[in-house]
Every structure is written in C-alpha cells, then in structure tokens.
Amino acid sequence: MCYGKCARCIGHSLVGLALLCIIANILLYFPNGETKYASENHLSRFVWFFSGIVGGGLLMLLPAFVFIGLEQDDCCGCCGHENCGKRCAMLSSVLAALIGIAGSGYCVIVAALGLAEGPLCLDSFGQWNYTFASTEGQYLLDTSTWSQCTEPKHIVEWNVSLFSILLALGGIEFILCLIQVINGVLGGICGFCCSRQQQYDC
C-alpha cells in the first residue's frame, strides 16, 4: 500500500475525530442544554482548558490537512531527483504528526484529570464544590454516590460521558498520529511508494 494513501486515510479520520472532539467539548459548556452554568462560572475547571476544542480539535486539523495533501501528485523533485520532493513531504509530515501527538496528548491528559476530579456541582450541603475530588476517581465505580450532586441535574453523567468521549477520541488521535510518524519515516526513508519503479511526472 502507498504511504501517501495511508497518510490520506489517517488525515480524513483525524478531521472527523477533531470535529467530534470540538462538539464534545462544546457540549461540556451546556449541561442539560442550559447556558446559565457557563455564565455563572459553575463548570468544572477542566472544561476551561479547551482540551477538545484546541488540543483534540483545531490543533489536530493542521496535521490532518497535511496528511490529506500528501497523496496529491503536485510535488516536484529536488536536487535533480523527482522522488525527493515526495520524500521531503513525507518526512515533514512527521513534524505535523508530532504536533498532532502534542494536541491529542493534551486532550487525553485534561480529559483524564477532568474525569478523576469529577464535576463542579451543588453538593448535598448546598454549596458549589468538587464533591468527588477527594475520592481519587473512585466515584466513577460507585454510581450510588452520584446523587450527592444535585445541580445541574445529571451533571455527573454528563461530565463522565463527555470527558470519556474526549479521552477516547484523543486516544485514537494519538494512535493515528503515532502511526503517521512511523508511516512518514518509512515513506521518507524507503521512498514515497513501496514500488520503487513508480515514476512521477513533474
């Protein structure tokens, strides 16, 4: 299989994943579809880290479009070698993939911290607090304690679901970018395509 085709496939996948990350992160700002919690600053502090919007979203679009552009046959040779431009492009995609790894890594770390800490909610005492912060993530295994959060309604389910989605999406993005690092190195060193006989018209 052509290294370029592989990169293009990864690129398209990353665009979809990035958009899903942005949507998941935006939903975190509106528990139960309400805007008041964001305006009153009653949202988990990790929501404000924009991990899905920036890390797993916008930052992921840069490598995604770089990867998609790799299969286009508009890259001419360098140093008198027609294949050299393609090889340079594949190697430069490694840099883009590293940016993707950083973005997805940030998304994964923030989502994991958000899950571990739990949501900011109105606790059983009637105060806005991180009710589960001291449980070190154990609240995730004991759903009976989730009723300790009384407002926003179902905030624990909301936070757990969306941060888990961000964690999973960020993880997949991380793996895809890692694959592209390997793909880009192989494509750059071994040649743009597995078939060394393949010629490109400039």
Epitope: R45, E117, L120, S124, F125, G126, Q127, W128, N129, Y130, A133, S147, Q148, T150, E151
Partner: antibody, heavy 118, light 113 residues
Framework: EVQLQQSGPELVKPGASVKISCKTS????????MHWVRQSHGKSLEWIGS?????????NYNQKFKGKATLTVDKSSSTVYMDLRSLTSEDSAVYYC??????????WGQGTTLTVSS | DIVMSQSPSSLAVSAGEKVTMSCKSS????????????LAWYQQKPGQSPKLLIY???TRESGVPDRFTGSGSGTDFTLTISNVQAEDLTVYYC?????????FGGGTKLEIK
C-alpha cells in the same frame, strides 16, 4: 420575598421528644438546601445539620447531633422538620432553620425557643 | 473539627470610628480548586436571627452597606467596619463551611465606648 416561618416555643420535660417545623415561601423550595443551627442562651451558634430536598432527600449531620436530631421534609407544603429526641436541659436553646446560598446562610427563620425543664 | 477563634471577644468603639475584628481557623479554608475561601460573616442583634454580611470571605451580601468589608485568605480573616454606626454595635460571628461539621467563632461584641 423569601420567608422562613418556624413553629412556636416549646416547653418539654427531660427525656421527651419535640418536632420543630420551618415553612418556607417566596422561592422554589427544591432549589436550596435547608440547614439547622442552634444557639444556647448567651452562647455562640452550633451547626446541627442540613437537608437537601433533591434526589430523594440528602441529609448531613454534625456528629454531635446524630441520634439527637432527625431532619425530614414535606415537599407538598415546602416545610422542613427537625425531630429532637431524648431531650435534656443541655438541649434548651433557640433553634433556627436557615437557607444556604453560595456559602452563606442568607435567610433565617425567626427561631424556635426550646426549654427542657422538669 | 475546624476551630474558629475570634478576637477580641469584645471591643469598645465610638460612632464614626473604623473597627477591625479577626477570625482565625485551625486549618485553611481556601479551596484550591474553586479558589474560594469558605468563610462567612454574620451580624446578630439582640433578640434577632443572625444576618449574613459577607460570604466567600470577601463578597458582600446584597443590601449590606459598603462600610462592611471582609478580607483575608487561608486561615486568617478580618471584618472591617469603617465609619461605625450606632446600629452596628452588636455581635459578629464568623463561620466556616469548608469541612463538616460547619463551625462558628465565639463572636466579637461591639460595644459603645
């Protein structure tokens, strides 16, 4: 206007039980947690516990008052109750119900004076 | 339990003066996650229920005159009344709601000089 109307003064004998009520009005009852505080004559304030009417009712108690106080609610009348049992002269005090907002008790009942005497 | 210590227990002042009272807690009341101090100040006049003046250590409750100011963080807090009025001469309590059981200070009584 937020109002917390408490039941009248009580004079009871040692060992008896009493039920103090706190009827709320002027706000959405389920939006706030109700707390109970007591003040012995000429002394400071003591937190007894809280009752959150959501999720089937969530109660928190000061360990000192566990077994002494029980908090209940009647949602239909937006009223919170506090049962006090095995009363002694030490329990003679003014008992307040109060609503929490942010981290402060922003509305208070007028207080219920409990006198335990033989 | 968190112990709240208020000082002085009583204070003699004249109308128009600026007065400062202290409240110290046995452990920090600052929540590092919410970045708020879980401390409130109350005023209680004889025969009346307490009245909320300050919450989150420094946020003035609506309707409370701006001569009342709360400050401090962690374990040391202060309530300042600038230009004391005759109606301010009463008892003031601080309260922590950082950890249950919530506890009140012993109070500071403002008296006429």
């Amino acid at each position: 206007e937020v109002q917390l109307q408490q039941s009248g003064p009580e004079l009871v004998k040692p060992g008896a039980s009493v039920k103090i009520s706190c009827k709320t009005s002027g706000y959405t009852f389920t939006d706030y947690t109700m707390h109970w505080v007591r003040q012995s004559h000429g002394k400071s304030l003591e937190w007894i516990g809280s009752f959150n009417p959501n999720n089937g009712g969530l109660t928190n108690y000061n360990q000192k008052f566990k077994g002494k106080a029980t908090l209940t609610v009647d949602k239909s009348s937006s009223t919170v109750y506090m049962d006090l049992r095995s009363l002694t002269s030490e329990d003679s005090a003014v008992y307040y119900c109060t609503r929490i907002r942010a981290t402060g008790f922003d509305s208070w009942g007028q207080g219920t004076t409990l006198t335990v005497s033989s | 339990d968190i112990v709240m210590s208020q000082s002085p227990s009583s204070l003699a002042v004249s109308a128009g003066e600026k007065v400062t009272m202290s409240c110290k807690s046995s452990q920090s009341l600052l929540n590092s996650r919410t970045r708020k101090n879980y401390l409130a100040w109350y005023q209680q006049k004889p025969g009346q229920s307490p009245k909320l003046l300050i919450y989150w250590a420094s946020t003035r409750e609506s309707g409370v005159p701006d001569r009342f100011t709360g400050s401090g963080s962690g374990t040391d807090f202060t309530l300042t009344i600038s230009n004391v009025q005759a109606e301010d001469l009463t008892v003031y309590y601080c309260k922590q709601s950082y950890n249950p059981p919530w506890t009140f200070g012993g109070g500071t009584k403002l008296e006429i000089k």
